[in-house]
Interface confidence: low
């Protein structure tokens, strides 16, 4: 299709080489009352179709995205050629940063509903650059945490080094939806609630003598509880002895509950004590069996192919640890009688 009639928007993504970050493009198709370029010819009031081609966000869920190759080749369907770009309704998600994402992206409705829709499309010219060392050293992260129940704020990474007074007007989106009230480089949240979690996008306009473009940054916001003040507790095994049958296989499970920590490095391991010796056992990987806002339950098993007499003289110790401290629970095997 002919893209010469598409509206054009220029965007800049300056990514940090220090962190993982994502990027999004919205298919900002014009609303009927604003758009003259959606119609092939200007219509006189009498000719306005009864159902305008675009009825706001309801119609935007079914759009097609293309990339325009720089060599003049035909438009490429994003879904077929770019595995690191994901389409979600009218949003295009870039999962990894890189200058190779620079280019022209075009979106248009999948369904042509009327002859007036033909030129209803948006062309986004995206320029991607790594952040230079001269940029602000302490810019806000693209992953920000808000503490549930407290006051918090979400900062626009590309503007976090500027004072509120210097900052240009910012347009914020949350999960693709415009936050019309917010215009500064920081969103202040009076009471952090679970639904403040999500993908926030901040846009502002930058101009030079030739043209203007939109500078965009994406912030993943997570709502969290405060870090635990407790060391982990072992939920299983509860008993310190276990009846077993000699010669039979045995699995002993260690389940431990770890309180939430922003920097989470849980340790759960088995070791064996035999008289004065003790050594760590190579066991299957630990797995998370339950995760809530406040804590996580992790399980790790020790597997004995056959229980031997020697195992009856040993102690099997589960050791768990977080940044606060550690807990252990030992199990002595006892032969089942009768």
């Amino acid at each position: 299709f002919n893209i010469s009639g598409c509206s054009t928007k220029k965007l800049l993504w300056t990514y940090s080489t220090r962190s993982e970050e994502e990027f999004v493009l919205f298919c900002d198709l014009p609303e009927p009352q604003k758009s003259h370029f959606c119609h092939r010819n200007r219509l006189s009031p009498k000719q306005v179709p009864e159902h305008l081609p675009f009825m706001g966000s309801n119609d935007l869920s079914d759009v097609q995205w293309y990339q325009q190759p720089s060599n003049g080749d035909p438009l490429e369907d994003i879904r077929k050629s770019y595995p690191h770009i994901i389409q979600d309704k009218c949003t295009l998600h870039f999962l990894t940063p890189g200058v190779n994402n620079s280019g022209s992206y075009i979106c248009r409705p999948k369904m042509i509903k009327s002859p007036y829709d033909v030129a209803c499309c948006v062309k986004m010219i995206l320029e991607v650059k790594p952040q230079t060392n001269a940029s602000c050293e302490y810019s806000a992260s693209h992953k920000q945490d808000l503490l549930l129940g407290s006051t918090g704020s979400i900062s626009c990474p590309s503007l976090s080094c500027q004072s509120d007074a210097q900052s240009p007007a910012v347009t914020w989106y949350k999960n693709g939806k415009l936050l019309s009230v917010e215009r500064s480089n920081r969103i202040v949240v009076d009471e952090v609630y679970d639904y403040h979690q999500g993908t926030y996008v901040c846009d502002y306009t930058q101009s030079d003598t030739v043209s203007s473009w939109t500078v965009r940054a994406v912030v993943q916001v997570r709502t969290i509880v405060g870090d635990t003040k407790l060391k982990p507790d072992i939920l299983d095994p509860v008993e310190d002895t276990l009846e077993v049958e000699l010669g039979k296989p045995l699995t002993i499970s260690c389940k431990a509950r770890f309180g939430f920590e922003r920097v989470f490095n849980p340790v759960i391991k088995w070791y064996i004590k035999d008289s004065d010796l003790e050594w760590e056992v190579s066991v299957p990987e630990a797995k998370s069996i339950k995760s809530t806002l406040k804590d996580e339950i992790i399980e790790r098993n020790i597997i004995l192919e056959k229980v031997t007499q020697r195992d009856l003289r040993r102690k099997f110790v589960c050791f768990v640890q977080n940044s606060i401290g550690n807990t252990t629970q030992s199990v002595q095997l006892k032969e089942k009688r009768g």
């Epitope: 549930l148 129940g149 949350k174 939806k177 415009l178 936050l179 019309s180 009230v181 009076d190 009471e191 609630y193 679970d194 639904y195 509880v225 809530t292 806002l293 406040k294």
Partner: antibody
Framework: SLEESGGRLVTPGTPLTLTCTAS????????MTWVRQAPGEGLEYIGF?????SPYYASWAKGRFTISRTSTTVDLKISSPTAEDTATYFC?????????WGPGTLVTVSL | DVVMTQTPASVEAAVGGTVTIKCQAS??????LSWYQQKPGQPPKLLIY???NLASGVPSRFKASESGTEFTLTISDLECADAATYYC??????????????FGGGTEVVVK
């Protein structure tokens, strides 16, 4: 303080809009919640609207109610009332902390 | 959706006594639980927010605690003015599609 208005006797199927008005503070920056209470029954949560005008509803209330806001009011529209919608309707400031409530407005749905 | 089970439905106690009301959540709701007091013909009044925080102007005779998914409201040194119906309300997940009625069934407190 908050005050609800618009409650009255309506026949089943007649749409009805209730309005919540604040005095002493601006509604603009607050999450606002609607709750109802049938005669002699417990409280029933309907939904809330955030400062950006996005409404969120209890699962049972979706499609039956519409919450909207202007800079000075928060409205609750009952699209097609039935006898089960007979109740006192309250609006409250906040979601996790409902610190200010209106006195309620009574809606009676009857033939 | 989260179901709040409030017990008992009714409780009677003497002036000066103590009453305990429990609310059990069907799943983890962090500390997103409020307690309200309602007297006949009046709107609910906030007593406790975020599980254990006393709302402004509420006497310290009202105490609330949380243990996992069980939440408790304790009223000590009962006064005649405490006769009312008490409701717990969970507000966790209020934007989820399956969010149902957030309130417990209510507990009527009768003061003798």
């Amino acid at each position: 303080s908050l005050e609800e208005s618009g409650g009255r006797l309506v026949t089943p199927g007649t749409p009805l809009t209730l309005t919540c008005t604040a005095s002493g503070f601006s509604l603009n920056n607050y999450y606002m919640t609607w709750v109802r209470q049938a005669p002699g029954e417990g409280l029933e949560y309907i939904g809330f609207i955030d400062p950006y005008s996005s409404p969120y509803y209890a699962s049972w209330a979706k499609g039956r109610f519409t919450i909207s806001r202007t800079s000075t009011t928060v409205d609750l529209k009952i699209s097609s009332p039935t006898a089960e919608d007979t109740a006192t309707y309250f609006c409250a400031r906040g979601v996790a902390v409902g610190d200010i409530w209106g006195p309620g407005t009574l809606v009676t749905v009857s033939l | 959706d989260v179901v709040m089970t409030q017990t008992p439905a009714s409780v009677e106690a003497a002036v000066g006594g103590t009453v305990t009301i429990k609310c059990q959540a069907s799943q983890s709701i962090s500390d997103y639980l409020s307690w309200y007091q309602q007297k006949p013909g009046q709107p609910p009044k906030l007593l406790i927010y975020r599980a254990s925080n006393l709302a402004s102007g509420v006497p310290s005779r009202f105490k609330a605690s949380e243990s996992g998914t069980e939440f408790t409201l304790t009223i000590s040194d009962l006064e005649c003015a405490d006769a009312a119906t008490y409701y717990c309300q969970c507000t966790f997940g209020a934007t989820n599609d399956d969010y149902g009625n957030a309130f417990g069934g209510g507990t009527e407190v009768v003061v003798k």
